[in-house]
Interface confidence: low
């Protein structure tokens, strides 16, 4: 009796029909920029305020007949998915609608910009609680639309958008490609990416996560009590907007960075069949389906990290790729990846007062990606220690020498075009965990951080025989901050983090043979924060169940939440 | 059409004095750029978002818009300022001929100009 999509976003171990929260999301206002809506529909009556904002182009075609139910269809359904009495995610959220799409579902970048400006001015005139803006629309890549989204996000507004229904790289569309926006792809009841006619959901590094977006039951504008099934990345985005409203209502002080990290953390991992995506996009596309958090307990103290992929560098010899974290996040490690294996490693460097992750292409390479590990680490003081290529044959080493600083990540960068194999593989001497080691011809960069209660440890997994993929994961309670490969020889394509697992990819076994050159070790740095754990316990001990604890714990409403961007 | 002609006359009269003595060169050392949608059917030529540099005040945005209108009028082009942005991004939305883009890119305070384009329900 519960729609599949609401069941899906409910955390495991709980059933969506066990709780009917009358005020889930009640402290949050959700702005919807879409078509006109049928505000007296039973699903949303009294929950959606239709603003006087309207900026739409004329409908195409001389024979177009304006029919109210068709004009309202898209927006009404989405308002129902966000906050509908029966089929809504955040049944307590109040909404405001702006009309930026005409009766054919078409709008303009300029109309959307003016709508976003209207929201910002409304926020300034009458500041309320947390704001979520749902943008269930897409156009071609737009610098100005992305810039406006960035400004609104930096003003404390959470923007959620559809990845797009073009079965294409979401980075080619706006606002999906804006890094500050939470971009949502669509999956179906079988956790498959949604196919829409000959097209389907967009994918790629600009998608933050997926959510239910096929056969979604919601309010139909055909009558005030009608329901209809609709599909698309708009529906998926509406689920995440609802989850965000639930999370923000429970914890109104959450920043965008914190919200995004929580969305990622509480998502279902590795359930999407990646075969649907083009091969070159699989590694870039997050295998995450949005879900509500089971409760706040156990969330506040965790060290949250996410992986951010850069754009592709392009094939020119000196091409580089840069991956950046959000303003509130710390870059704790940097790695690189090249499908051809021709790369010159990566380094962390300062840019505009913040560390970024830069990967370097090599001659004859098809291009590289930089991969940043971006974490929430309050009061952190991080720096990069570099060791130039070693003179001796033993390899390059660098460690965190400052008192109280721990190693969170290792990077290596080399100028030579082809880093020869280094035999035997350099393994870290036991008892020296705060040390990065690498090839003697590479410079090594250690990310060293001081933060209250931060502790880290190194985990290695070495495979003596050639293998295309070597992984090592952090155990429960620890978070992956760094991921790199030893010895960093030419057959290693690169390393990257997937959730809490470090993945090291190597060239096809058939090309490397079965010599010791095939040996590769995946090195994970796993961290946790005792300070965050302690602060969380103190908070729970000193408050009589405030915020999320009220809603999620006391009421046993185990409901929703979701995650953020790869740019 | 009559309304547009009326607007045009009014603009020429109102702005002729304002354009006198105004430099047309951009601020030194910076070059404004033009952007348009890569998907041709989604382009909406004739309407442009002129984005000004970050710290530009509303009064400067309005002045820049009027300057564009004045310089366009002097060349015999009608322009219409559809909206002046402030609060999120400084700039303005203008309906004008694409012939004026080179001129608009040289205006002071201009960061970049983007041709309007379509967005669609997903």
């Amino acid at each position: 009796s519960i729609p599949w999509n609401l069941e899906r976003i409910t955390p495991p171990r709980y059933r969506a029909d066990e709780y009917q929260p009358p005020d889930g999301g009640s402290l949050v206002e959700v702005y919807l920029l879409d078509t006109s809506i049928q505000s007296d529909h039973r699903e949303i009556e009294g929950r959606v305020m239709v603003t006087d904002f309207e900026n739409v182009p004329e409908e195409d075609g001389t024979r177009f007949h304006r029919q109210a139910s068709k004009c309202d269809s898209h927006g009404t359904h989405l308002a129902g998915v966000v906050s509908g009495r029966d089929a809504g995610v955040a049944k307590g959220a109040s909404m405001r609608s702006l009309r930026v799409l005409n009766c054919q579902g078409k709008g303009t970048v300029s109309g959307t910009l003016i709508g976003l400006e209207f929201i910002r001015k409304s926020q300034l005139v009458q500041p309320v609680g947390p704001l979520v803006v749902l943008l269930p629309l897409a156009g071609g890549y737009s610098r100005v639309l992305n810039a406006a989204c960035q400004r609104l996000a930096r003003a404390g507004v959470v923007l959620v958008t559809a990845a797009g229904n073009f079965r294409d790289d979401a980075c080619l569309y706006s606002p999906a490609s804006a890094p500050e926006v939470i971009t949502v792809g669509a999956t179906n009841a079988q956790d498959q990416p949604v196919t829409l006619g000959t097209l389907g959901t967009n994918f790629g590094r600009c998608v933050d996560l997926f959510a239910p977006g096929e056969d979604i039951i919601g309010a139909s504008s055909d009558c005030s009590t009608c329901f209809v099934s609709q599909s698309g990345t708009s529906q998926a985005a509406a689920h995440v907007a609802g989850i965000a409203a639930m999370m923000l209502s429970a914890e109104p002080e959450l920043t965008l960075a914190e919200l995004r990290q929580r969305l990622i953390h509480f998502s279902a991992k590795d359930v999407i069949n990646e075969a649907w995506f083009p091969e070159d996009q699989r590694v870039l596309t997050p295998n995450l389906v949005a879900a509500l958090p089971p409760s706040t307990h156990g969330a506040g103290w965790q060290l949250f990290c996410r992986t951010v992929w850069s754009a592709h560098s392009g094939p020119t010899r000196m091409a580089t790729a840069v991956a950046r974290c959000a303003p509130d996040e710390e870059l704790l490690s940097c790695s690189s990846f090249s499908r051809s294996g021709k790369r010159r490693g990566e380094r962390m460097e300062a840019q505009g007062g913040k560390l970024v992750c830069r990967a370097h292409n090599a001659f004859g390479g098809e291009g590289v990606y930089a991969i940043a590990r971006c974490c929430l680490l309050p009061q952190a003081n991080c720096s990069v220690h570099t060791a130039p290529p070693a003179e001796a044959s033993m390899g390059t080493r660098v460690h965190c020498h400052q008192q109280g600083h721990v190693l969170t990540g290792c990077s290596s960068h080399w100028e030579v075009e082809d880093l020869g194999t280094h035999k035997p593989p350099v393994l870290r001497p036991r008892g020296q965990p705060n040390q990065c080691v690498g090839h003697r011809e590479a410079s090594i960069h250690a990310s060293c951080c001081h933060a209250p209660g931060l502790e880290c440890k190194v985990k290695e997994h070495g495979i003596p025989a050639p293998q295309e993929q070597v992984t090592v994961a952090c155990e429960e309670g620890w978070t992956l901050t760094g991921c790199s490969a030893l010895p960093g020889t030419s057959h290693v394509l690169g390393a990257y983090a997937v959730d809490n697992t470090c993945v090291v990819r190597s060239r096809d076994v058939s090309t490397t043979g079965s010599t010791s050159e095939g040996a590769v070790t995946a090195v994970a740095i796993c961290c946790r924060s005792r300070h965050l754990a302690q602060a969380s316990q103190e908070l729970q001990g000193s408050t009589s169940g405030s915020g999320l604890n009220d809603i999620f714990e006391a009421q046993k409403i185990e409901w929703h939440e979701h995650h953020h961007h790869h740019h | 059409q009559e309304d547009e002609d009326g607007d045009y006359e009014e603009l020429v009269l109102a702005l002729r004095s304002e354009e006198d003595g105004l430099a047309e060169a951009p601020e030194h050392g910076t070059t404004a750029t033009f952007h348009r949608c890569a998907k041709d059917p989604w382009r909406l030529p004739g309407t442009y978002v002129v984005v000004l540099k970050e710290e530009t005040h509303l009064s400067q945005s309005e002045r820049t818009a009027r300057r564009l209108q004045a310089q366009a009028a002097r060349r015999g082009y009608l322009t219409k300022i559809l909206h002046v942005f402030h609060g999120l991004l400084p700039g303005f939305l203008v309906k004008m001929s694409g012939d004026l883009l080179e001129l608009a890119l040289k205006l002071p305070h201009v960061d970049y100009i983007e041709e309007d384009s379509s967005v669609f329900a997903q």
């Epitope: 519960i2 009358p22 009640s26 009294g46 029966d86 089929a87 329901f227 009421q555 046993k556 | -």
Partner: antibody
Framework: QVQLVQSGAEVKKPGASVKVSCKAS????????MHWVRQAPGQGLEWMGY????????KYHQNFKDRVTMTRDTSISTAYMELSRLRSDDTAVYYC??????????????WGQGTTVTVSS | DIQMSQSPSSLSASVGDRVTITCKSS????????????LAWYQQKPGKAPKLLIY???TRESGVPDRFSGSGSGTDFTLTISSLQPEDFATYYC????????FGQGTKLEIK
Amino acid sequence: QVQLVQSGAEVKKPGASVKVSCKASGYTFNDYWMHWVRQAPGQGLEWMGYINPSSGFTKYHQNFKDRVTMTRDTSISTAYMELSRLRSDDTAVYYCARQYDYDEDWYFDVWGQGTTVTVSS
Amino acid sequence: DIQMSQSPSSLSASVGDRVTITCKSSQSLLNSRTRKNFLAWYQQKPGKAPKLLIYWASTRESGVPDRFSGSGSGTDFTLTISSLQPEDFATYYCKQSFNLFTFGQGTKLEIK
């Protein structure tokens, strides 16, 4: 006037199923959720679940969710509650009650007269 | 689930008496958006269906005499009958609708 009229008393054997009907009149059926509440002899009131007639959505109390099915036929403005795998402790008076479909009106303003279900071997 | 506990479970009183029945919930019933308490009071006479008296903790249902009043917020609620009438002898139930629906165990009001 507004009325909820329930079907007559039933006597069932353990393991059987019972289906109680509740016919609404005097108001728009789709505008009100229909709840089912039962009361064992000499005991208090126990909420079982509800159905929203306009959408067909249901919510069941966890004590009943494996055995209860609530349905409706909007063409005849009637709600149904079927309870399967009956046990002797299911002997009770079963009431239907309506609740206006608005998020602040979570109370039952009109009740059916009750249907007595006796489970006995 | 939210637990509801009523007290007393039974009480004897005379016509004209002022009677108070209390109801406690295991968590707050205050809806933060509407600022309303999702608590209702019902009266049930033997062999009859329950009848709504009070909703939102303190709002009287139309047609209910004004001698019935409800008060309280959060977790503690009270039903007061200011001057008992013969027809008021019945069982009274409180009910929360904040998290699904739960009734109190009932308070039986008998003639002394």
